[in-house]
């Protein structure tokens, strides 16, 4: 409920529990497509990572909008895509062939860890420096699906391995606040 | 779903210094900002300061520089206001915020009672 | 510090009525204005934000306008839990201020 997300047309959305809407391609975004930036899918003859079979992380670079005001650098976030198996003849380990079920388990690829990074924002004539924390997906998966999952899930957080450095924000009285590198990427 | 429970009431003598603390569920505290605002008897809200748990920054109000400490247990998902050299005039409900933003609070603790009174 | 002149401090209105609450700053704040709601005993809780984005819940009778130094709240059929106190927050500026409150009782 708490958790929003970012449009480029100055508006926020706000999704709903447990959602994290795919943000839709725009004009100030460069994509990196799966086959150049995402993670390659895994082979199809490992069996145990058939389910993982072409899920892909594709790669979305966009200044974000919070009301009148824009992030002072992009951020680049993923967008989970792809099939989790597809409906033909899998060969498995051994050399047989195993055969994708369309009412077998329903695998998807969906978000498997979240990171939340700090954002300095810049607001047109406002004197007092000001950052949000947007909730963006770290990697992918395919996952099986149950009743209780939704399009992502909400408490899957994972830590981040990098502890960013603690830098200097700006201070009150500093008019046009510079954007801060270390502000900039305390990502979780 | 989101909550913010704060610990009870605190009466203190002039001088002294109270320290409220504000559990956080629903999700990591330091996914968010966390903020401090009162309220006097019969009076208007008044900003405090925010701090940011994942990095220890704060940002306090003028009003209270030197005189206020807002810290974390990220541990614990818990957030701590200390006040000291307490005042009659410090008498208020305290509340904890939290929200994704430095500027706006989204979710709001039930609040905590402090009386100063010699 | 910017200083947020709310009014009127109280009004007395029915249900189904429509009410408008201002809030006036002392300096342009440009869109940076958050209302908030508080019932007796009760924490605030946030109704809009840059001035006229709808918090996340809150029902679309709540609607807020405004830029620079003058901001609206409007309530547009007021119904039996809306009444309450509604304060306006500005955070152009350091330190972020609220106003003073308008409460609104039933008629």
């Known amino acids: 409920q708490g958790w929003q997300a970012f449009r480029n047309d100055a508006t926020e959305v706000i999704p709903g529990l447990g959602e994290y809407p795919e943000p839709p391609p725009e004009n100030n975004q460069t994509m990196n497509r799966a086959e150049n930036g995402g993670r390659p899918p895994h082979h199809p003859y490992d069996a145990k990572d058939v389910s993982e079979y072409s899920c892909r992380e594709l790669h979305y670079t966009r200044f974000l909008t919070d009301g009148p005001c824009r992030s002072a650098k992009p951020v680049t976030e993923l967008v989970c895509s792809g099939q989790c198996g597809p409906a033909r003849l899998l060969p498995n380990a051994i050399g047989r062939v195993k055969w994708w079920r369309p009412n077998g388990p329903d695998f998807r690829c969906i978000p498997d860890r979240y990171r939340a990074q700090r954002v300095q924002l810049l607001c047109p004539g406002g004197a007092a420096p000001r950052s949000r924390k947007v909730r963006l997906v770290a990697s992918c998966k395919c996952k099986r699906l149950t009743r209780f999952h939704n399009q992502s899930e909400l408490k899957d957080f994972g830590p981040e391995t990098a502890r960013p450095q603690k830098g200097r924000k700006p201070r009150p009285g500093a008019r046009g606040a510079k954007a801060n590198q270390a502000e900039l990427e305390n990502a979780y | 779903q989101v909550q913010l429970v704060q610990s009870g009431a605190e009466v203190k003598k002039p001088g002294a210094s109270v320290k409220v603390s504000c559990k956080v569920s629903?999700?990591?505290?330091?996914?968010?900002?966390q903020h401090w605002v009162r309220q006097a008897p019969g009076k208007g809200l008044e900003w405090m300061g925010w701090s940011d748990p994942e990095i220890g920054d704060t940002e306090y109000a003028s009003k209270f520089q030197g005189r206020v400490t807002m810290t974390e247990d990220t541990s614990t998902d818990t957030a701590y206001m200390e006040l000291s050299s307490l005042r009659s005039e410090d008498t208020a409900v305290y509340y904890c915020?939290?929200?994704?933003?430095?500027?706006?609070?989204?979710?709001w603790g039930q609040g905590t009672t402090v009386t100063v009174s010699s | 510090d910017i200083q947020m002149t709310q009014s009127p401090s109280s009004l007395s209105a029915s249900v189904g009525d429509r009410v408008t609450i201002t809030c006036k700053a002392s300096q342009d704040v440009h869109t940076a204005v958050a209302w908030y709601q508080q019932k007796p005993g009760k924490a605030p809780k946030l109704l809009i934000y840059?001035?006229?984005t709808r918090w996340t819940g809150v029902p679309s009778r709540f609607s807020g306008s405004g830029s620079g130094t003058d901001f609206t709240l409007t309530i547009s059929s007021l119904q039996p839990e809306d009444f309450a106190t509604y304060y306006c927050q500005q955070y152009s500026d350091y330190h972020w201020t609220f106003g003073g409150g308008t409460k609104v009782e039933i008629k």
């Open positions: 840059w001035a006229s």
């Open positions: 629903g999700f990591p505290i330091k996914h968010h900002f």
């Open positions: 915020a939290t929200g994704h933003t430095t500027y706006k609070f989204d979710f």
